[in-house]
Interface confidence: medium
Amino acid sequence: LPAQVAFTPYAPEPGSTCRLREYYDQTAQMCCSKCSPGQHAKVFCTKTSDTVCDSCEDSTYTQLWNWVPECLSCGSRCSSDQVETQACTREQNRICTCRPGWYCALSKQEGCRLCAPLRKCRPGFGVARPGTETSDVVCKPCAPGTFSNTTSSTDICRPHQICNVVAIPGNASMDAVCTSTSPTRSMAPGAVHLPQPVSTRSQHTQPTPEPSTAPSTSFLLPMGPSPPAEGSTGD
C-alpha cells in the first residue's frame, strides 16, 4: 500500500522533521505550510486549520519561504553616490551599489551601506593597488626612474624617457625633458613598460599588484571623513 500523504496541518512523527516548505509551529505543535516569497502569514495555523498567507504590501518584501506576521521593509532609496542595481519588489529588497569612482566602505547583507570616493594618488605617487568594489586605491611613491604627474585613482608610475641629451632630469612627479629629437623609453626597475606614443601622458592600464616597501597608504575610516593619506588627495 502506498504511504498516506499527510495534509497540513499534521503532527510529525517523533524525531522527524516537517517536509519542504513546511515548518513546525511551536504553538499548534503541528507541521504547517510556509508562505511563499512575496507573502507573509496573515493567520497562523492551528491544530485544525493551515497557515493563511497574504501578499506583501508596497515597499515590503519576503525573499524566503516564511511564516512571518509582517513582510520586511525595503531599504531606503539609494543615495546620490549609489546606483540601484535591484529594485524593491514583493520578493526582493532594493540593492544599492556604489557608482563608478567610488567603493563600498561599509557593506550590508546585499549591496552597500556607505560608499566612499576612490583615493586619488597625487603627483609623485602612482597606484600600487587599484580600487575594487570593496577596497580603496593604494598609492605608492614612484621609484627612481619612474614618475607620475597626475592626480588620479588609476594612473601608475611610468618610466622616464631616456634622452640623448637631458635638458631637465626627471623626478618622481615629472618626466625627463630632452633636447634631443629622438627620446627613447627606459626599462627602469619596478616600472611597468607599456609601449605607447611619447606624447601620451595618461596611463589607465591596471597595474599588477606588487609588494611595496613604502608604508601602506590605504586605511579605512567609515565613521566620518578621513584626512588624505600620504600621496593621495581628497579632491
Partner: nanobody
C-alpha cells in the same frame, strides 16, 4: 535549504558547564534566526534561546535566563550555547533549529530545519 549539525553534549554534574555548537550551512543563512530547543522524556518540546544571524539580537526562555548565553560566529557560520550552572531539569536532547527572519520578538515561533540533536545529561 539549510543543514544544521549540533555537537558538544555530554554528561555533567549539577552546577557544571557545557558549550553546545550548531554548525549551519545553506543559502541565505544571514536572513535566519538560529535557535535551540530541547526535548526530554515526558516533557513538551521547549524553546531555550535564539539569535538573529544578521543583527545578533538574542532571546532566552525564563528557565535559562542568566545561566545560558547564545552567541554566533558568522565567519564560521556557527552558533554556540554556553550553559552554566546546569541543573538536572536541563537534561534532554538539545536541537538547533532555524526560522527565517525570526528571533526579534521572542523565542522562535517554529522551526523549518532542525538537526539530529545532542544529548545533555545533568546528573551526579
Amino acid at each position: 535549504e539549510l543543514q544544521l549539525v549540533e555537537s558538544g553534549g555530554g554528561l555533567v554534574q549539577p552546577g557544571g558547564s557545557l558549550t553546545l555548537s550548531c554548525a549551519a550551512s545553506g543559502r541565505f543563512l544571514e536572513y535566519y534566526a538560529i535557535g535551540w530547543f530541547r526535548e526530554a522524556p515526558g516533557k513538551e518540546r521547549e524553546g531555550v534561546s535564539c539569535i538573529s544571524m544578521s543583527a545578533g539580537s538574542t532571546n532566552y526562555a525564563d528557565s535559562v535566563k542568566g545561566r545560558f548565553t547564545i552567541s554566533r560566529d558568522n565567519a564560521k557560520n556557527t552558533v554556540y550555547l554556553q550553559m552554566n550552572s546546569l541543573k538536572p531539569e536541563d537534561t534532554g536532547v538539545y536541537h538547533c533549529a532555524s526560522e527565517p527572519y525570526g528571533c526579534d520578538d521572542g523565542l522562535l515561533r517554529g522551526y523549518d530545519y532542525w538537526g539530529q540533536g545532542t544529548q545533555v545529561t545533568v546528573s551526579s
